[in-house]
């Protein structure tokens, strides 16, 4: 049990103890949510105190202060997903429609997602906000007719399901054009019932 002497400058539990070189001893670190209020000596172990409101320490530490909680910066495109606690900093993420453009241990700056052009959609990612859109083509039988960061490819209209006949097949950028079976001229509107 700390404190105890250490000649080789290493401690038995690296996570929860640290080497104090002045006394050549191993002392306890303070648990998450606390800080060192009194340093250890040969006869007394570290004394810890709870972090004050609006401050935190995330790890086992031998810091003499707690870190100040910082809000998520909306100017940098960030929003809060979990508040700061004594044991954890404020959890931030990119606002909807944005992705992380600068990373330094955590996201520091978000930017607007790129539009995907007609005929494409954003490839689905494991984690929202992780990277910019990578636009991929619509699968066969699907279309997407806008420039948008979030539009999804939709299946082509099946004219027969609406009792209509196909006037022009769909492409990646346009829906199937349907017409009434009795119509001879192709209509101007796509994927809709025209009388």
């Amino acid at each position: 049990v700390p404190p105890y002497g250490s000649e080789n400058q290493t401690c038995r539990d690296q996570e929860k103890e640290y080497y104090e070189p002045r006394h050549r001893i191993c002392c306890s670190r303070c648990p998450p949510g606390t800080y060192v209020s009194a340093k250890c000596s040969r006869s007394r172990d570290t004394v810890c105190a709870t972090c004050a409101e609006n401050s935190y320490n995330e790890h086992w530490n031998y810091l003499t202060i707690c870190q100040l909680c910082r809000p998520c910066d909306p100017v940098m495109g960030l929003e809060e997903i979990a508040p700061c606690t004594s044991k954890r900093k404020t959890q931030c993420r990119c606002q909807p429609g944005m992705f992380c453009a600068a990373w330094a241990l955590e996201c520091t700056h978000c930017e607007l997602l790129s539009d995907c052009p007609p005929g494409t959609e954003a490839e689905l990612k494991d984690e929202v906000g992780k990277g910019n859109n990578h636009c991929v083509p619509c699968k066969a039988g699907h279309f997407q007719n806008t420039s948008s960061p979030s539009a999804r490819c939709q299946p082509h209209t099946r004219c027969e399901d609406q009792g209509l006949v196909e006037a022009a097949p769909g492409t990646a950028q346009s829906d199937t054009t349907c017409r009434n079976p009795s119509e001879s001229l192709p209509p101007e509107m796509s994927g809709t019932m025209l009388m």
């Epitope: 790129s114 539009d115 995907c116 052009p117 005929g119 494409t120 490839e123 689905l124 990578h134 636009c135 991929v136 083509p137 619509c138 699968k139 066969a140 420039s147 022009a168 097949p169 492409t171 990646a172 950028q173």
Partner: antibody
Framework: EVQLLESGGGLVQPGGSLRLSCAAA????????MTWVRQAPGKGLEWVSL????????YYADSVKGRFTISRDTSKNTLYLQMNSLRAEDTAVYYC?????????????????????WGQGTTVTVSS | DIQMTQSPSSLSASVGDRVTITCRAS??????LNWYQQKPGKAPKSLIY???SLQSGVPSRFSGSGSGTDFTLTISSLQPEDFANYYC?????????FGQGTNLEIK
């Protein structure tokens, strides 16, 4: 210099399987979509399959859908085409190709611009 | 699916001639049209992308034009090394289809 080198072709019986490989060099493999194109003896080019840079999105010609699987291993800079339930009509030279992305394009979409580099091809013969 | 039709299927010409090959799409494909050259026993070579943009390293005697459904590949002055098969390909809508090819041979 950008290079693509296919391997894995050969003679296989109908119903059999084969895995083609395409080793890529000279470019950032993980940044580009990749394509397989085939050419039956004395015939024209036929688009077979396409894979996105991440490998998460894949596309197939109707003639191979459900039988062929395209994949990629970024750590090995290699593109694959797993071919199952092979038929006589799958006999062809198979080319892998790198999709083109022109420098002057504003909207980053590699898929509209075809391919710019081709491998030398590997021959697959399906016959009993 | 979008069908690509090339014409002519074969063409005889002489060195120095101006040659035009056409490609027609069954639907509007904007300018998402590419041209490839292939010599017998060799892999295809990319010539033109986006209907009219030359791939790097391709001689300027090759040019492409068109938009929508009708496209052309023009070789302004045929060289001996230009005798080959030429293919167009649309990259507008999956599946990305090729034309049937045009065989350009020496007259």
């Amino acid at each position: 210099e950008v290079q693509l080198l296919e391997s894995g072709g050969g003679l296989v019986q109908p119903g059999g399987s084969l895995r083609l490989s395409c080793a890529a060099a000279g470019f950032t493999f993980s940044s580009y979509p990749m394509t397989w194109v085939r050419q039956a003896p004395g015939k024209g080019l036929e688009w077979v399959s396409l894979i996105s840079p991440s490998g998460a999105t894949t596309y197939y010609a109707d003639s191979v859908k459900g039988r062929f699987t395209i994949s990629r291993d970024t750590s090995k800079n290699t593109l694959y085409l797993q071919m199952n339930s092979l038929r006589a009509e799958d006999t062809a030279v198979y080319y892998c190709a790198k999709n083109h992305y022109p420098d002057d394009v504003i909207i980053k979409n590699y898929y509209f611009y075809g391919v710019d580099v081709w491998g030398q091809g590997t021959t697959v013969t399906v016959s009993s | 699916d979008i069908q690509m039709t090339q014409s002519p299927s074969s063409l005889s010409a002489s060195v120095g001639d101006r040659v035009t090959i056409t490609c027609r799409a069954s639907q509007d494909i904007s300018n998402y049209l590419n041209w490839y050259q292939q010599k017998p026993g060799k892999a295809p070579k990319s010539l033109i992308y986006a209907a009219s943009s030359l791939q790097s390293g391709v001689p300027s005697r090759f040019s492409g034009s068109g938009s929508g459904t009708d496209f052309t590949l023009t070789i302004s002055s045929l060289q001996p090394e230009d005798f080959a098969n030429y293919y167009c390909q649309q990259t507008h809508t999956i599946p990305y289809s090729f034309g049937q090819g045009t065989n350009l041979e020496i007259k």
